[in-house]
């Protein structure tokens, strides 16, 4: 069996840091046999038999001139076998990011700190950290380690597939070269990494008769699962085309009657999305909408859509009203006390 | 020789912008992760924000968020700070410094002020 | 954020005086501490990585020693050109937080 250690990387090539002292090792022959060194493709012998150094070349202060492949010869000549030497880094501790557009998925992504120059691979595990009483600050032991699925395998993301919004976790990147292993451990709270996507199908239309109402609607983000315990709050902006500075409000629920619309004037409208009870926070803004206030006089009939007033545009105390919205009937999360122990932030 | 400078620093009113630049010589810049450090007028120092190599992972300090932006090209050697809607409290020298890793700075620039003020 | 306290806030010792400066993290950090030097009007430099590790160039009398939450930085022999502000500073985190600084003189 060869005398050289396999690194974690391609056959035939080993492994050395610049300005270190790098040993190749020739794979061929028994440990301790002596043998000459020769750089491929150059007569000049580098290392002798005598050297005392047995099947091993030492390179005082390797540098990116040693870098190459290198020939051992037995005493009689037979080839020992071929080396490639490769110089790099060994690994910093990988820089992680972790975020979740629901309350069940959160996935992580990750970059290297600094660039090693080696083969590199990345190991994910994560462990659940569970709160043992309301009251407690103590944390039961860690359950896991499980995997966490690289998706698709090779990419510099893993995914978390029902993960518990109370929990906290414990992320593990490791980043492996021939050179060793680093490891950053985050630690992550649903809660605050909380990012929903942006809400989907934003429509704006003008109100027939009212030349300074626009009506917006939008609905909840796709990716958003399809139950009424964990709902989305929404934050409207619009402003007048060429008009630097945008409105915000808070509507209460898909849709929004904006009433100080500029006559005439086409509008951009954007809406964004966080949960209800204010974890995380505020989607990316949706694509912007535009729509333009409606300039006809007033309809005799009421829009289909909704009861609006039909006296002439003064600007009425009382909006259209709003479209239902998910029930609030009272569930679990709505009857958590959010106390210090589940206010965990993400520790980055 | 290995070096760091700043560059863009200047008075801005408040509400203003500026663009901090940071040119590297000396070493090869797209392997290390970058940082701006800032130090307000007499005071101690400050991390702002930091970059991977890549440029496609990037950290700030809570003061600055969503008003800085970090930004690098490593055609160009060059690491840059963009800084939005200033405030009286962002005024301080800013250093960029240089990895190894995330968040240990071997090497640092000479610096450039920046005075937000009316 | 991990929070960095450092004792004393300054002091005045002579020269070849041993001086010692700690700095305590408000939670654990393993090694992950950097001490800087930073003189008047210069930008700050690297002394000590990763709680005790000596940055190549830096003179032997600077050391470093500590983990988890409580490390010590200590001059050997303190000299004229060591006065400045010293920072201690985490990255544990992967928002690194200073210390608040220790300005040594000469008495």
């Known amino acids: 069996s060869s005398p050289c250690p396999q690194a974690w990387g391609p056959p035939g090539v080993q492994y050395g840091q610049p300005g270190r002292s790098v040993k190749l090792c020739c794979p061929g022959v028994t440990a301790g046999d002596p043998v000459s060194w020769f750089r491929d493709g150059e007569p000049k012998l580098l290392q002798g038999p005598d050297s005392g150094l047995g099947h091993e070349l030492v390179l005082a202060q390797a540098d990116s001139t040693d870098e190459g492949t290198y020939i051992c010869q037995t005493l009689d000549g037979a080839l020992g076998g071929t080396v490639t030497l490769q110089l790099g880094y060994p690994p910093a501790r990988p820089v992680v990011s972790c975020q979740a557009a629901d309350y069940e998925n959160f996935s992580c992504t990750w970059s290297p700190s600094q660039i090693s120059g080696l083969p590199t691979r990345y190991l994910t595990s994560y462990r659940k950290k569970t709160v043992l009483g309301a009251d407690s600050q103590r944390r039961s032991p860690s359950t896991g380690p499980w995997p966490c699925p690289q998706d698709p395998l090779g990419a510099a993301r893993c995914v978390v597939h029902g993960a518990e919004f109370w929990s906290q976790y414990r992320i593990n990147v490791t980043e492996v070269n021939p050179l060793g292993a680093s490891t950053r451990l985050l630690d992550v709270s649903l809660q605050s990494i909380l990012r929903p996507d942006p809400p989907q199908g934003l429509r704006v239309e003008s109100v027939p008769g009212y030349p300074r109402r626009l009506r917006a609607s939008w609905t909840y983000p796709a990716s958003w699962p399809c139950q009424p315990h964990f709902l989305l709050k929404f934050r409207l902006q619009y402003r007048p085309a060429q008009h630097p500075a945008w409105s915000t409000v808070e509507p209460a629920g898909l849709e929004e009657v904006i009433t100080d619309a500029v006559a005439g004037l086409p509008h951009a409208v954007r809406v964004s999305a966080r949960d209800f009870l204010d974890a995380g926070t505020w989607s990316t803004w949706s694509p912007e909408a535009w729509g333009t206030p409606s300039t006809g006089t007033i309809p005799k009939e009421i829009p289909a859509w909704g009861q609006l007033h039909t006296q002439p545009e003064v600007e009425p105390q009382v909006d259209s009203p709003a479209p239902p919205r998910p029930s609030l009937q009272p569930h679990p999360r709505l009857l958590d006390h959010r106390d210090s122990v589940e206010q965990v932030a993400v520790l980055a | 020789e290995v070096q760091l400078l700043e560059s863009g620093g200047g008075l801005v009113q408040p509400g203003g912008s500026l663009r901090l630049s940071c040119a590297a010589s000396g070493f090869t810049f797209s392997v290390y992760s970058m940082t701006w450090v800032r130090q307000a007028p007499g005071k101690g120092l400050e991390w702002v924000s930091s970059i991977v190599p890549y440029g496609d992972l990037t950290q700030y300090a809570d003061s600055v968020k969503g008003r800085f932006t970090i930004s690098r090209d490593n055609s160009k050697n060059t690491l840059y700070l963009q800084m939005n809607s200033l405030r009286a409290e962002d005024t301080a020298v800013y250093y960029c410094?240089?990895?190894?890793?995330?968040?240990?700075?071997?090497?640092w620039g000479r610096g450039t002020l920046v005075t937000v003020s009316s | 954020d991990i929070q960095m306290t450092q004792s004393p806030s300054s002091l005045s010792a002579s020269v070849g005086d041993r001086v010692t400066i700690t700095c305590q993290a408000s939670?654990?950090?393993?090694?992950?501490l950097n001490w800087y030097q930073q003189k008047p009007g210069k930008a700050p430099k690297l002394l000590i990585y990763?709680?005790?590790n000596l940055q190549t160039g830096v003179p032997s009398r600077f050391s470093g020693s500590g983990s988890g939450t409580d490390f010590t930085f200590t001059i050997s022999s303190l000299q004229p050109e060591d006065i400045a502000t010293y920072y201690c500073?985490?990255?544990?985190?992967?928002?690194?937080?200073f210390g608040p600084g220790t300005k040594v003189d000469i008495k």
């Open positions: 500073q985490q990255h544990e985190s992967q928002s690194p937080t």
């Open positions: 939670q654990d950090i393993n090694n992950y």
């Open positions: 990763d709680a005790s």
């Open positions: 410094a240089k990895g190894p890793g995330w968040g240990s700075f071997d090497l």
